[in-house]
Amino acid sequence: MMTGTIETTGNISAEKGGSIILQCHLSSTTAQVTQVNWEQQDQLLAICNADLGWHISPSFKDRVAPGPGLGLTLQSLTVNDTGEYFCIYHTYPDGTYTGRIFLEVLESSVAEHGARFQIP
């Protein structure tokens, strides 16, 4: 049974040209995490595999950095980076847990972080 919950950084905003850290945390489960995927819509950005470590998709290598931890750092942000990002935890025996983050990239210098929230 899937008992875990994913806590994410929620709705966040950042300035164009800047960087942002996407973070998720899986709790309330003893399941083994075998891999974490970071995706934007249906595009795979990066993988953190328990055996192999990090793999960044070639098309994002210049602007995506692994970490901190299981998080992901997006750099040189553009307005086109605005949208939904997903952390997908592959675990055993529970299965797949998904967290959602919405990033808004702002032209102005007014960029505030949203509150953290829970996704069951």
Epitope: I47, N49, A50, H90
Partner: antibody, heavy 119, light 107 residues
């Protein structure tokens, strides 16, 4: 070209043992998690076991836990399934399959090897 | 375990027809359903995963839709090489489980 080829199937008596092998080629074997899936006659496909790319994580269906052992030799590009205490209900075609890099499905399968457990 | 009910178990159709195959999960599996094609004596072939993602090299006449418990595989215009057995599989939680298959036959 990605290829996975199973071998080692055959006829075995109940309580007996068998070791299946799966030879992989055409891809970097050590980068991919691998699975065994079986299909009994006139039955649906059944996931049996999985092993992570480096071999540090192994997972089993409840029906085979304690009897089957999945392992791999990345130097030989080979996946194994050691089957002990075999039962009649283990009779099936056994497929070796590669898990996608993003862990979502099984993207390349072998043709299968037949295991028959009968006295 | 998540039970997968696939329907119909068999369907007869002609080249050029539009065909749909359905799978229903016993509980929500989010979008995590894959579809495979298998021909007699051959290895299963991945067509669709995560509900609607088309596997590389698979013709665009194949499409997948659905989320939660109800999913559909659609073949928009049947080609001669599409006559085969199709299986769905949930990849949301362990053990991964499969539907019973749909045999697509020539009418």
């Amino acid at each position: 070209e990605v290829q996975v080829v199973e071998s080692g199937g055959g006829l075995v008596k109940p309580g007996g043992s068998l070791r299946l092998s799966c030879a992989a080629s055409g891809f970097t074997f050590s980068t991919y998690a691998m699975s065994w899936v079986r299909q009994a006659p006139e039955q649906r496909l059944e996931w049996v076991a999985e092993i992570s790319s480096g071999g540090s994580h192994t997972f089993y269906s409840d029906t085979v836990t304690g009897r089957f052992t999945i392992s791999r030799d990345n130097a030989k590009n080979t996946l194994y399934l050691q089957m002990n205490s075999l039962r009649a209900e283990d009779t099936a075609v056994y497929y070796c399959a590669r898990k996608t890099l993003d862990y979502y499905a099984l993207d390349y399968w072998g043709q299968g090897t037949t295991v028959t457990v009968s006295s | 375990d998540v039970q997968i009910t696939q329907s119909p178990s068999s369907v007869s159709a002609s080249v050029g027809d539009r065909v749909t195959i359905n799978c229903r999960a016993s509980k929500s599996i989010s979008k995590y359903l894959a579809w495979y094609q298998q021909k007699p004596g051959k290895a299963p072939k991945l067509l669709i995963y995560s509900g609607s993602r088309l596997q590389s090299g698979v013709p665009s006449r194949f499409s997948g839709s659905g989320s939660g418990t109800d999913f559909t595989l659609t073949i928009s215009s049947l080609q001669p090489e599409d006559f085969a057995t199709y299986y769905c599989q949930q990849h949301n939680e362990y053990p991964w489980t499969f539907g019973g298959g749909t045999k697509l036959e020539i009418k």
